[in-house]
Interface confidence: low
């Protein structure tokens, strides 16, 4: 029986149940090769509290649909007197990167995971030529996730003192030159994640091969190598390679661009100081405030919630967007869709789509950018669930009693972007 996601096969993936201090290793095509879980375990559970291992999914006992992968075991679990078997269930949703499996919950018998990934999309529009896992867990089982840095088109220009060359990189995946109008990148060879531009010529100096690695608690490393056998004539017989070290800064700061720190015989070393290299709990919250013990800032957007059925309205030419953030008040237009952002077609107001649901909320403050994300909306034709990204700016003189209003700025592949100037986005440093 075919596994529906071959692009996820090359790696053993990790997911964590932080509440119970459990690390899962997942290999959806082969086995995880952890001796303690046996030779054919596809999902191996490592309980760090008891220091025990259990196979909770066997690679041979696999059943699959387009959006669900189940691994059974032969281990019994008594659930209300019935003789069930322990199993793992992975629900797949369309995403714009390879993504990461996320632990959802576990019962006595079933371990549930959810995975938003390009592999689950109905169309190939988000698929890369080459992409590698872009997250790691540290020894405290905290997640460091660079997926938000992955560019679906275009690339990052590396800060370099050489006026004759420009080095462009992407994170964890190749540079999509077809979707990018930038003329400099057009010449980059397909598959390259590190492209060196000299005059009118562009050279592949690295492709992603292995996933992201953790070298210290605050340092992540990504290595690219040139797969093609032919040597470049300006590399003195050496094969090009690129090492990008992502550094979590010791204190809150604005974002920086990647900097070239060393170059020798086409071996490029890049350092990128970015808060995305920090653990996710430092950057994100599922509520509308960031002020927990993990974060060293104080942000509270809850005053932006609207009560009494009213919503913020943002004009998007063909569509009107109704927004109700930081609450669970139904938007009247949105037909009980539990939408935080609702898209209504002006020419036909019966065409209503949820562009993100209030249960699927993430507030993120990273590299000086404050962003509220709502995902899990109605599906587009690609299979991608509509989502909305609201970028907040501090404005102490915002109208509407300081709340301000959201402004629609555009849509890319069923992701809707808004900016919102408000006094509630003014970040306060937390007292030590």
């Amino acid at each position: 029986q075919a596994a529906p996601f071959p692009e996820l096969c090359s790696y053993t993936w990790e997911a964590v149940d932080t509440k119970n201090n459990v690390l899962y290793k997942i290999n959806i095509c082969g086995s995880v090769d952890i001796v303690q879980c046996g030779p054919s375990s596809a999902v191996c559970m490592h309980d760090l509290k008891t220091r025990t291992y259990h196979s909770v999914g066997d690679s041979v006992l696999r059943s699959a649909t387009r959006s669900l992968l189940e691994f059974n075991t032969t281990v019994s679990c008594d659930q209300q007197g019935t003789n069930h078997r322990v199993q793992s269930s992975i629900a797949f949703l369309c995403g714009k990167t390879l993504g990461t499996p996320e632990f959802v919950t576990a019962t006595e018998c079933v371990h549930y995971f959810e995975w938003r990934t390009t592999a689950a999309c109905k169309k190939d529009i988000f698929k890369a030529n080459k992409e590698v896992p872009c997250y790691v867990f540290d020894e405290e089982l905290r997640k460091h996730d660079l997926n938000p840095l992955i560019k679906l088109s275009g690339a990052y220009l590396v800060d370099d003192s050489d006026p004759d060359t420009s080095l462009f990189i992407n994170v964890c995946r190749d540079i999509d030159t077809l979707r990018d109008p930038g003329s400099q990148l057009r010449a980059c060879p397909p598959g390259t994640a590190a492209c060196l531009v000299r005059g009118h010529q562009a050279f592949d100096v690295g492709q992603p091969r292995d996933g992201l690695k953790l070298v210290r608690k605050d340092r992540l490393v990504l290595s690219y190598v040139r797969e093609e056998a032919g040597k470049l004539d300006f590399c003195d017989g050496h094969s090009p390679a690129v090492t990008i070290t992502f550094v979590c800064p010791s204190e809150r700061r604005e974002g920086t661009i990647p900097k070239l720190t060393a170059k020798s015989n086409c071996r490029y070393e890049i350092e990128w100081i970015t808060e995305y290299a920090c653990h996710r709990d430092y950057l994100e919250s599922k509520t509308c405030s960031l002020s927990g013990e993990q974060q060293d800032v104080s942000i509270d957007l809850t005053p932006l919630a609207q009560s009494g059925g009213s919503s913020y309205i943002s004009d998007g030419k063909e569509y009107l967007f109704y927004l109700n953030v930081c609450g669970e008040t139904e938007i009247q237009f949105c037909n009980k869709k539990q939408a935080a952002v609702c898209q209504v077609k002006k020419s036909d107001t019966s065409q209503v789509k949820a562009a993100g649901r209030y249960h699927n909320q993430t507030l993120r403050y990273s590299d000086g950018d404050l962003t509220l994300i709502y995902f899990g909306g109605d599906e587009c034709s690609s299979g991608f669930q509509r989502m909305s990204v609201i970028n907040f700016e501090c404005n102490k003189t915002a109208g509407n009693d300081g709340k301000g209003t959201p402004v629609f700025t555009g849509e890319v592949d069923c992701t809707y972007f808004f900016t919102w100037d408000t006094e509630y986005a003014c970040v306060k440093e937390k007292e030590d």
């Epitope: 029986q1 075919a2 596994a3 071959p6 096969c9 095509c29 082969g30 086995s31 041979v60």
Partner: nanobody
Framework: QVQLQESGGGLVQAGGSLRLTCAPS????????MAWFRQAPGKEREIVAR????????FYTESVKGRFTISGDNAKNTVYLQMTNLKPEDTAVYYC???????????WGQGTQVTVSS
């Protein structure tokens, strides 16, 4: 359609040896890994040994470690199981499994009977 054919089974005395072979008939294909399973009467099918072609790694179930050796020829999609110092509890039908690279389909052989008498 890919078909796997096991051979080499038979009746052997305890302490004896057998070499099982699993080879494809029909079109060839490249495999992700190949494995030997066995099923004794009234018991669940269990994995015996597996070889991963990508890195050559092998795994054995605890009860056969040091007695059984899995090997193979990736180019021919052929896998062998050398069984030595056989015990009566090794009596079972032995099945071969191949998981293909492209479609990740699983292909099973028909099985070959191994009987170890005391």
């Amino acid at each position: 359609q890919v078909q796997l054919q096991e051979s080499g089974g038979g009746l052997v005395q305890a302490g004896g040896s057998l070499r099982l072979t699993c080879a494809p008939s029909g079109r060839t294909y490249s495999t992700y890994w190949m494995a030997w399973f066995r099923q004794a009467p009234g018991k669940e099918r269990e994995i015996v040994a597996r070889i991963n072609w990508s890195d050559g790694s092998t795994f054995y179930t605890e009860s056969v470690k040091g007695r059984f050796t899995i090997s193979g020829d990736n180019a021919k999609n052929t896998v062998y199981l050398q069984m030595t110092n056989l015990k009566p509890e090794d009596t079972a039908v032995y099945y071969c499994l191949a998981r293909t690279v492209v479609s990740l389909d699983d292909y099973w052989g028909q099985g070959t009977q191994v009987t170890v008498s005391s």
